[in-house]
Amino acid sequence: LQDPCSNCPAGTFCDNNRNQICSPCPPNSFSSAGGQRTCDICRQCKGVFRTRKECSSTSNAECDCTPGFHCLGAGCSMCEQDCKQGQELTKKGCKDCCFGTFNDQKRGICRPWTNCSLDGKSVLVNGTKERDVVCGPSPADLSPGASSVTPPAPAREPGHSPQ
C-alpha cells in the first residue's frame, strides 16, 4: 500500500490530526521535500546576521553577515569580525601584520611576502603590511640592452568561496 503522505508536495506536511491530509506549512515554517510529516521552523537572521533570502513555504531563509563581519561555516552558521587590510584577527582581536608579512583582505591571517630571489627575480616594489612584494625581471634581464619587462599587476582582492 502506498503511503498517502508521499503525495504531499514540498510546502505542505502530512497532517496526522486530519486523516493525513496535506496541509500547507504554517507561517514561518517550510518543507523543502515532499512527504514530510512536519514542517521545519524558518531560520531567523537576527543580530549580526542579516537576511540574504527570505523563508518561503518550500525553502529556509538564508543569512549573511552585516557589514564589518564575514560568514564562517556551512550556510553562514557564524559571523566573525572583519579586520582592516594589514591586520589579522587573533584570539585577542585585530593586530597589525608583523614585518615581512601582509594581508590584503579583511579576513584571514598575514601571509609572508614573496621571496623574489627564489625564482631568480629582483624586488621591483617593496612589500607593505597591506601588499605583497612585486617581483621584477631577473637580474640578468636588467643588463644594458635587455628588453623591458612589464611588472605583474598586484593581486586583486580575491573572492571568497561560498562556505
Epitope: 587573533t90 591571517i109 601571509r111 598586484p154 593581486a155
Partner: antibody
C-alpha cells in the same frame, strides 16, 4: 562547479625533472592562490608551496627551494609545478589545491592527484 | 612548527572518535582537518578550528585550545574509516604550511 584537473602519471629517472599541470575551471583562476601538496607512499601529506596566479608570486617550503618552480598560464587557467634533480624519495602523488580566497583557512578544492614515480 | 597526532585511533561503529593534534600554543592558531581515503584526494572536513564546509555532516566537529586541537566524529560509520590530518599555517617560519603526521581511524 569548481574543478581542478591534473595531468597524468609520470615515470622519471633519477636526476630528471617533472612538470605537473593543474587546470582550473568553475571560478576566476587569478583570484585564488594555488598550493601544491604531495604524499609519498606510506607517508603523510607534505606542503610544497604556493603561487599567486595573478602576480606569479611564490612561496616554497625550504626543503624544496632550489629544486621546485611553480608557474602559471592565466590564458588557460593552469598552474604548473616543476621539480628538478629528482630522487627516488620524490616518488609520490602530487596534488594541487586551492586556497579559499584568503590566507589562513583550509584548502577547499583539490585536484585528483598525479603519481610521479622516480626509478632507474 | 611541529604538529603531533596519534598514529591510529580505533572505535566501534556508532561510538565517538576523538583525534588529537598537539602543538605549542596551537590554541592561538587556526587548525584545519582533512580526511584522506586511499586513492582519493584529501577532503577538507573542518576549517578554522570548528567550521564545517558545506556537505560535511554535523556529527563531525572540531575544537582547539591550549596545546591541543581535537577532531570529533560522533556516531561513527564504516565510511569514516580513513586517515585524518590536521594542518596550520605558520607565517613566522620558512615552511608556512604544516601538516600533522596523520591518524588512521580504524572502525572495529
Amino acid at each position: 562547479q569548481v574543478q581542478l584537473v591534473q595531468s597524468g602519471a609520470e615515470v622519471k629517472k633519477p636526476g630528471a625533472s617533472v612538470k605537473v599541470s593543474c587546470k582550473a575551471s568553475g571560478y576566476t583562476f587569478t583570484g585564488y592562490y594555488m598550493h601544491w601538496v604531495r604524499q609519498a607512499p606510506g607517508q603523510g601529506l607534505e606542503w610544497m608551496g604556493w603561487i599567486n596566479p595573478n602576480s606569479g608570486g611564490t612561496n616554497y617550503a625550504q626543503k624544496f627551494q632550489g629544486r621546485v618552480t611553480m608557474t602559471r598560464d592565466t590564458s588557460i587557467s593552469t598552474a604548473y609545478m616543476e621539480l628538478s634533480r629528482l630522487r627516488s624519495d620524490d616518488t609520490a602523488v602530487y596534488y594541487c589545491a586551492r586556497e579559499p580566497g584568503y590566507y589562513g583557512s583550509g584548502l577547499d578544492y583539490w585536484g585528483q592527484g598525479t603519481l610521479v614515480t622516480v626509478s632507474s | 612548527y611541529v604538529l603531533t597526532q596519534p598514529p591510529s585511533v580505533s572505535v566501534a561503529p556508532g561510538e565517538t572518535a576523538r583525534i588529537t593534534c598537539g602543538g605549542d600554543d596551537i590554541g592561538d592558531k587556526r587548525v584545519h582537518w582533512y580526511q584522506k581515503k586511499p586513492d582519493q584526494a584529501p577532503v577538507l572536513v573542518v576549517y578554522e578550528d570548528r567550521y564545517r564546509p558545506s556537505g560535511i555532516p554535523e556529527r563531525i566537529s572540531g575544537s582547539n585550545s591550549g596545546n591541543t586541537a581535537t577532531l570529533t566524529l560522533s556516531r561513527v560509520e564504516a565510511g569514516d574509516e580513513a586517515d585524518y590530518y590536521c594542518q596550520v599555517w605558520d607565517s613566522s617560519s620558512d615552511h608556512p604550511g604544516v601538516f600533522g603526521g596523520g591518524t588512521q581511524l580504524i572502525i572495529l
